[in-house]
């Protein structure tokens, strides 16, 4: 058992059928010695008497808010949450496995640039009685500061008979050094509490590996005189690190016909303009990636040819 | 470069960008193989990193690019020695068309561009013990290539910026 915060305790339960459970001794926080009784949650049933109460925690029915009383007055409370382990594995029932980029991915994080700012998000199908708290640091043995904001419900999605809730958090490294080569990974720890269930999730990454630029902006098409060709141009997204001579992007461009089956020619370039053949009803698209490190490509930015 | 002369920024830019391409073709599985393990905070201390105080940021390069170039050269020589060691030459053998050979040669080429004949900067000692098991060697290769990818990305940014803003 360990203290999560004042008067809130997490009981680590290695659960299997007929498991003996964990013995927990609760102590009433009072100078009083006599006439103390204990109850669980709103039930008026007296569980025991005396300054301490010993309970055997075997299941969620044994968790909850234990209160010691004297003469009808509450003296102190202890909220017991369960962190369940089955077959040697801590439970991961609260968050959905996003399975990308690999199985057992519960937290996903992205950064738009090298400023040390990043966003993490996760999915759950639980809609009520749910709280999250997030901590982050650079490195674990001698951690350097990362400050995270409040967790927000960022999206709700219905897919068939599934309803998903997406939560996200933004974090910022306190002393970011965008030009340096990262030596220690960022660690993100999320505590999830649903009713009386406690779970924790972690992710470890380098900012360089979670970079995903915003799409290029200001796509423009300029038809060339007496030619089927057009000159296309675009700009670096506003959110990308500067100066661009240092933090350079590379681009992938394509012309996509109206039919999705039509063959698309992709061209890679470091420039911010190109000459392409852009037929009527087709569209021109461009996406960006860090020029020197193969992290994620941005989403496509598109403009119709006509 | 030693003694304050400028490097051939454009040549260094081309070669460092080639290094990036080669490092990724040698080990492309970036997102699908998590090679960080417990204790990695210690093991990564062995390889030279371009750190915050090394002057490799745009402002630092404008003030005095020598500190940064020396750090880059140290790293290039370190990785060049690693790629030539039995970590890469031992079993399991690299495939004949492996880009590691080209990568090795390009590391050497760029480090020589940064130090013409006759100049000798002190270089970092390379850790000698190599793992005995082939599977350990394979894992170490992946870790070295992952680390090299990060290192050459910063070096390439430095040379691109230098070529754009510091070339005479």
């Amino acid at each position: 058992i360990w203290e999560l915060k004042k008067d809130v305790y997490v009981v680590e339960l290695d659960w299997y059928p007929d498991a003996p459970g964990e013995m927990v001794v609760l102590t009433c926080d009072t100078p009083e010695e006599d006439g103390i009784t204990w109850t669980l949650d709103q039930s008026g049933e007296v569980l025991g008497s005396g300054k301490t109460l010993t309970i055997q925690v075997k299941e969620f029915g044994d968790a909850g808010q234990y209160t010691c009383h004297k003469g009808g007055e509450a003296l102190s409370h202890s909220l017991l949450l369960l962190h369940k382990k089955e077959d040697g594995i801590w439970s991961t029932d609260v968050l959905k496995d996003q399975k990308e980029p690999k199985n057992k991915t519960f937290l996903r994080c992205e950064a738009k640039n090298y400023s040390g700012r990043f966003t993490c998000w996760w999915l759950t199908t639980i809609s009520t009685d749910l709280t999250f708290s997030v901590k982050s640091s650079r490195g674990s043995s001698n951690p350097q500061g990362v400050t995270c904001g409040a967790v927000t419900l960022s999206a709700e999605r219905v897919r068939g008979d599934n309803k998903e809730y997406e939560y996200s958090v933004e974090c910022q490294e306190d002393s970011a050094c965008p030009a340096a080569e990262e030596r220690l990974p960022i660690e993100v720890m999320v505590d999830a509490i649903h009713k009386l269930k406690y779970e924790n999730y972690t992710s470890s990454f380098f900012i360089r590996d979670i970079i995903k630029p915003d799409p290029p902006k200001n796509l423009q098409l300029k038809p060339l005189k007496n030619s089927r060709q057009v000159e296309v141009s675009w700009e670096y997204p506003d959110t990308w690190s500067t100066p661009h001579s240092y933090f350079s992007l590379t681009f992938c461009i394509q012309v996509q016909g109206k039919s999705k089956r039509e063959k698309k020619d992709r061209i890679f370039t470091d420039k911010t303009s190109a000459t392409v053949i852009c037929r009527k009803n087709a569209s021109f698209s461009v996406q960006a990636q860090d020029r020197y490190y193969s992290s994620s490509w941005s989403e496509w930015a598109s403009v119709p040819c006509s | 470069v030693p003694g304050g002369s400028s490097p051939a920024w454009a040549q260094c830019q081309q070669l460092s960008q080639k290094l990036c391409t080669l490092a990724w073709s040698a080990h492309p599985l970036v997102g699908h193989m998590d090679l960080r393990e417990e204790g990695d905070e210690e093991t990564t201390n062995d390889v030279p990193h371009i750190q915050c105080g090394d002057g490799c940021d745009p402002q630092g390069l404008r003030d005095n690019s020598q500190f940064c170039l020396q750090r880059i050269r140290q790293g290039l020589i370190f990785y060049e020695k690693l790629l030539g060691s039995d970590i890469f030459t031992g079993e399991p053998s690299l495939l004949p068309d492996s880009p590691v050979g080209q990568l090795h040669a390009s590391l050497l080429g760029l480090s020589q561009l940064l130090q013409p004949e006759g100049h000798h900067w002190e270089t970092q000692q390379i850790p000698s013990p190599s793992p005995s098991q082939p599977w350990q060697r394979l894992l170490l290769r992946f870790k070295i290539l992952r680390s090299l990818q990060a290192f050459v990305a910063v070096a390439a940014r430095v040379f691109a910026h230098g070529a754009a803003t510091l070339s005479p």
Epitope: P17, F60, G61, D93, T125, D161 | -
Partner: nanobody, 123 residues
Amino acid sequence: EVQLVESGGGVVQAGESLRLSCAASGYNVKDYEMGWFRQAPGMEREFAAAISWRGSSTYYADSVKGRFTISRDNAKNTVYLQMSSLKPEDTAVYYCAAGRLYPSSRSRDYDYWGQGTQVTVSS
């Protein structure tokens, strides 16, 4: 919202078997832990059995252990309670319940309840 509909109740002789079914519908039903409770006339509702959302783990009250088996078919969104060696004291209304805390034998840890199905065991 999750809807639960029990079926399969009836009148049987002591020693016989019965299989109850609980059909679940609504959002995310596959993510719920499922349980069976029962309530005899004039008694409090009591826990009988529960199964985890993956279906890999089960939990039973001592009074039914070895006689009742809980199972689930996630493809059909259905939970079953196979009851054998029935006794007169098993007579009760059997309720299907869905919640997100497993294992729990406490009724208020379950969020959704069915209407119940009557099981009568005569001697």
